[in-house]
Interface confidence: low
């Protein structure tokens, strides 16, 4: 894999006028260095909510029973090792995948200190060859590992308990000005290694970032739980090139991947090779019919492919985004070598089917042709593959540059970091965090509905066993119907003998209404998959309606919107389960159940098992929520 990147590439296409000599700076400007970094920013609100919801004040619980916090930054070793090439003591070759067991093996390097973070307001982790060797290879003779990890437990633990502001961690290539293009190649390898932040907060009993498989199972009422977060790009890592477009003239290693892998000059196998034009001239490789020697012949290096049989060879771009309809692929190929093979370009969008890019040739001088194909503006990040399919016994292909042009209008949308959260059951089953504390037992022993849920702030998790849990009514006159917490004791409700929030709408001469208001909830984290879950039931005949209203406290003004409504209902006497997405809630909010009924109404309206998903406060979707498909999910 040629995973470096050229920065100062040739301007213009080889087809038009004398090309400039390629030039690459030895070191990067501050802005360019920033573009080589992978930045993790955990918002301050996450810290506030994690502290409030999961970490009780230390005075109220014994030290031994206090939840613990851990953190690490993990990278896959394979792309980093490929950059270094084979090294002594590595027990699997850099080009081949790690053995299966390496998936779980990791070596942990020391992360940054709290002192550093407090002083600089961000932690910068620099990754260079030495750290890669230490983290992925280790002492000679030891097996290579699959994961390189930086231990950030001390730092995360401090930040989540005592820190202020957001947590900023920047991972970047170590700064060394010795070798041309080195930082760029290292940056590409870092991105390919899918860096991710791992956080864990666990109550009494759990003790590692690994999956807890062989753990004793405490009783469900024991305060034991284990939450894990992974922060990573919500799309495969985008090349920093995607902000500027990609232009690769093969004079320096480029941020492209080659299949079969790129070979150096000494290796004569049938694969892509980078060769200087002078050598090609000496070998008469590019002497097509009528080709003349010229000072306008492309200088520098290009790719040559010498194939022996029917085969397929590919050049693959890094992940890109396009914010312009004018985004185009341009590839310069030597046309006299083409009759024995052909080029096919494919657009490979993330999570979508590949589609072909129609290539239009623009003939240039001295046998070179520029093939251009329109990419446009795909919705998702994408890669572009250029395949050369040879169709004879011997085939030659030469490529002088590969460019993705006009792909950005201003700044690209860039990638979005997602903070994915999960709950680990005692037996190792991993649930999405939203499945915890939802009154549905997903863990084998029910620990996802245990003590942790009952310790949440008032109103977050309510089955009305202990009263109204924060739901209140205005001052009531003695004759006004009111919401009550009591059991539905009745032969038809054998399955539901616990308490519920009830309203009895008896026959009245005039219309009546009754409102009950929840406790106030904090503003959900922006673009969290926030949901309200509850059971509801209407028994009898309701001549009227019941609404659930969400009221936001927007800068002192109260703004209400109806999120659920049922009208003129002949109750089935069945409990129905409902999940309501709470989208676009940006302020503190509360809920109101409003019932209105008129003459002839004889119904009981009941609500139970009301919960606000922990996702609202502890999960970040990578992409902003799109306001669609927001109808409540309902089931009996």
């Amino acid at each position: 894999v040629g995973s470096g990147m050229g920065t100062g590439q040739r301007a213009g296409s080889p087809a038009a006028g004398p090309p400039l000599q390629p030039r690459e700076p030895l070191s990067y400007s501050r802005l360019q260095r920033k573009s080589l970094a992978v930045d993790f920013v955990v918002p301050s609100l996450f810290r506030v909510y994690a502290r409030d919801l999961l970490l009780p004040p230390s005075s109220s619980e014994l030290k031994a029973g206090r939840p613990e916090a851990r953190g690490s930054l993990a990278l896959d070793c394979a792309p980093l090792l490929r950059l270094l090439g084979p090294a002594p003591g590595v027990s699997w070759t850099a080009g081949s995948p790690a053995p299966a067991e390496a998936r779980t093996l990791s070596r942990v390097l020391k992360g940054g200190s709290v002192r550093k973070l407090r002083r600089a307001k961000q932690l910068v982790l620099e990754l260079g060859e030495e750290a890669i060797l230490e983290g992925c290879v280790g002492p000679p003779g030891e097996a290579a590992v699959g994961l390189l990890q930086f231990n950030l437990s001390e730092l995360f633990s401090w930040w989540i308990r005592q820190g202020e502001g957001r947590l900023r961690i920047r991972l970047m290539p170590e700064k060394k000005a010795s070798e041309v293009g080195r930082e760029g190649r290292l940056s590409a390898a870092i991105r390919a290694s899918q860096p991710r932040l791992l956080f864990q907060i666990f109550g009494t009993g759990h003790s590692s970032l690994e999956s807890p498989t062989n753990m004793p199972s405490p009783s469900p009422d024991y305060f034991t739980w284990n939450l894990t977060w992974i922060m990573k790009d919500s799309f495969p890592f985008l090349s920093h090139r995607s902000r500027y477009g990609l232009e690769c003239s093969f004079d320096f290693p480029c941020e492209l991947e080659y299949s079969p892998p790129l070979h150096d000059l000494r290796n004569q196998s049938w694969s892509w090779r980078r060769i200087p034009s002078e050598e090609a001239s000496q070998m008469d490789l590019l002497d097509g019919p009528g080709a003349e020697r010229s000072k306008e012949m492309p200088r520098g290096s290009f790719l040559l492919l010498n194939t022996s049989a029917d085969s397929k060879h590919t050049i693959l771009s890094p992940w890109m985004r396009s914010s312009s309809e004018h985004c185009t692929l341009a590839v310069s190929v030597h046309r006299h070598l083409q009759p024995s093979g052909r080029y096919i370009a494919q657009l490979l969008p993330h999570n979508e089917a590949a589609r072909e890019i129609l290539l239009m040739p623009t003939p240039g001088k001295h046998g070179w042709t520029v093939l251009q194909g329109r990419i446009g503006r795909p919705d998702n990040p994408f890669r572009v593959a250029l395949e050369y399919i040879s169709s004879g016994n011997r085939s030659l292909s030469a490529v002088d540059f590969f460019a993705l042009k006009n792909c950005s209008e201003g700044t690209s949308p860039g990638s979005k970091m997602a903070l994915q959260s999960s709950f680990t059951c005692w037996n190792g089953t991993v649930l999405q965090l939203g499945q915890a504390c939802d009154f549905h037992q997903d863990c084998a022993q029910g620990e996802d509905e245990s003590q942790m849920c009952r310790k949440l702030p008032v109103g977050f998790y309510c089955n009305f066993e202990d009263g109204f849990c924060g739901w209140t009514q205005g001052t009531l006159s003695p004759h006004t119907p009111q919401w009550q917490v009591r059991t539905l004791k009745d032969a038809r409700f054998q399955d539901h003998q616990d308490h519920a929030l009830l309203l009895s709408t008896t026959d009245v001469p005039a219309s009546e209404s009754a409102t009950v208001t929840s406790a106030t909830f904090p503003a959900p984290i922006k673009s969290s998959p926030c949901e309200l879950r509850m059971s509801w039931l209407i028994r009898g005949v309701l001549r009227g309606n019941v609404s659930l209203v969400l009221v936001e406290n927007k800068t002192g003004k109260e703004q209400g919107r109806m999120v659920w409504h049922v009208a003129a209902y002949e109750g089935l006497s069945l409990w129905q389960w409902m999940v309501l997405p709470l989208l676009d809630v940006s302020d503190r909010f509360w809920l109101q159940m409003v019932a209105w009924w008129g003459q002839g109404s004889r119904a009981i309206v009941a609500f139970d098992n009301i919960s606000i998903s922990l996702d609202c406060y502890l999960t970040i979707s990578g992409e902003d929520k799109i306001l669609q498909n927001t109808a409540p999910k309902s089931r009996n």
Epitope: R103, S211, G428, W577, K633, R635, N636
Partner: antibody, heavy 120, light 107 residues
């Protein structure tokens, strides 16, 4: 092609145990979970549980906890289910199936089925 | 557990007919539903996953639809090889549960 080959029919005495096997071929064994199903005329198809051959992690239907023990051997690409303390209620056809982690949650390949008869 | 109910336990139809098999869940399952075909010899095949996605290699005469608690499998042009028992299965909650099956026979 992709196959899940199950062991042959078993006739066992009440109170005994039996181990059924499911040998995978034609795909990378550790890329898929193996799930087990029970089929009887009375209760139809029931999901017993699953094992991740890569990690050995398991999840069970509460109903079959203690009744079924799932294991897997990566080296032979074989999954096993041990059924304990057998009674006539355990007489059934048992299927192993595979389920890809990254996919929607479906069983795309099913084994041939093993008939277990519990009788004295 | 979520109960899956296939109200019609057996169904007779003629070759070329359009046949619909229904399945209902005891609570909403958010389209997390698959359909399987079991031949008389016991062979089981996946037909449809996630309510309406056709599994590879399955003829296009099979289609699925539904939402909430009610789902259906449709065979648009019944062929002899479609004689089998059809099962729905939900994967919204653990344990994954199946319907009782609908046996399809030729008139």
């Amino acid at each position: 092609q992709v196959q899940l080959q199950q062991s042959g029919a078993e006739l066992v005495r009440p109170g005994a145990s039996v181990t059924l096997s499911c040998k995978a071929s034609g795909y990378t064994f550790t890329d898929y979970e193996i799930h087990w199903m029970k089929q009887t005329p009375v209760h139809g198809l029931e999901w017993i549980g699953t094992i991740d051959p890569e990690t050995g992690g398991t999840a069970y239907n509460q109903k079959f906890k203690g009744k079924a023990i799932l294991t897997a051997d990566k080296s032979s690409s074989t999954a096993y289910m041990e059924l304990r303390s057998l009674t006539s209620e355990d007489s059934a056809v048992y299927y192993c199936t595979r389920c890809y982690y990254g996919s929607s949650w479906y069983f795309d390949v099913w084994g041939t089925g093993t008939t277990v008869t519990v009788s004295s | 557990d979520i109960q899956m109910t296939q109200t019609t336990s057996s169904l007779s139809a003629s070759l070329g007919d359009r046949v619909t098999i229904s399945c209902s869940a005891s609570q909403g399952i958010s389209n997390y539903l698959n359909w399987y075909q079991q031949k008389p010899d016991g062979t089981v095949k996946l037909l449809i996953y996630y309510t309406s996605s056709l599994h590879s290699g399955v003829p296009s005469r099979f289609s699925g639809s539904g939402s909430g608690t009610d789902y259906s499998l449709t065979i648009s042009n019944l062929e002899l090889e479609d004689i089998a028992t059809y099962y729905c299965q939900q994967y919204s909650k653990v344990p994954r549960t199946f319907g009782g099956g609908t046996k399809l026979e030729i008139k």
